[in-house]
């Protein structure tokens, strides 16, 4: 995130409810910190289509968070 500035969240707005699984290249989870007080789920899309924030309250986001947490712990 080249433009990332301290003290602010990476996403603006509530985020998309779902992204087609076939379009997902990578999912990153940013946990609450001094920079942002909420969890953010950032999806990198395939074919150089950029990034999108997933609504952390959505079913898909909850599944991704669970999957990542299982993998990491």
């Amino acid at each position: 995130f080249p433009m990332f500035k301290r003290g602010r969240c990476l996403c603006i707005g509530p985020g998309v409810k779902a992204v087609k699984v076939a379009d997902i290249e990578k999912a990153s989870i940013m946990y609450p910190s001094n920079n942002c007080d909420k969890i953010e789920v950032i999806i990198t899309l395939k074919e150089n289509k950029g990034q999108r924030c997933l609504n952390p309250k959505s079913k898909q986001a909850r599944l991704i968070i669970k999957k990542v947490e299982r993998k990491n712990f």
Epitope: M3, C11, I12, G13, P14, G15, K17, V19, R52, C53
Partner: nanobody, 129 residues
Framework: EVQLVESGGGLVQAGGSLRLSCAAS????????IGWFRQAPGKEREGVSI????????YYADSVKGRFTISSDNAKNTVYLQMNSLKPEDTAVYYC??????????????????????WGQGTQVTVSS
Amino acid sequence: EVQLVESGGGLVQAGGSLRLSCAASGFNFDDYAIGWFRQAPGKEREGVSIISSSDGNTYYADSVKGRFTISSDNAKNTVYLQMNSLKPEDTAVYYCAAGQGWVIATMTSFRAHREYDYWGQGTQVTVSS
């Protein structure tokens, strides 16, 4: 049917002001961030300013900070961009967009995605020196 209608563009002298309006309809305002983007001839479309109607969070490109102010009237489903101290380099077509999942860091070279973004037709802003 989703509609975003921009108004308020025009020709202004350097140092002058304009106020752009974007009237939105056909979708739930609170589910989207609403932003102003601009495209100058031969340049990429870039994010200028964005507001999240659900929580009031805002974003401004470095080039407009302190000069432009974004605001929204949720009762009217309308977003405004007050542009002061305009410079010739602000000359561009200004588009209003409603989008989901915008990542602030990608706003300087924005890639539109028709699944998540709605766009207006654009309004020309010309700043003469």
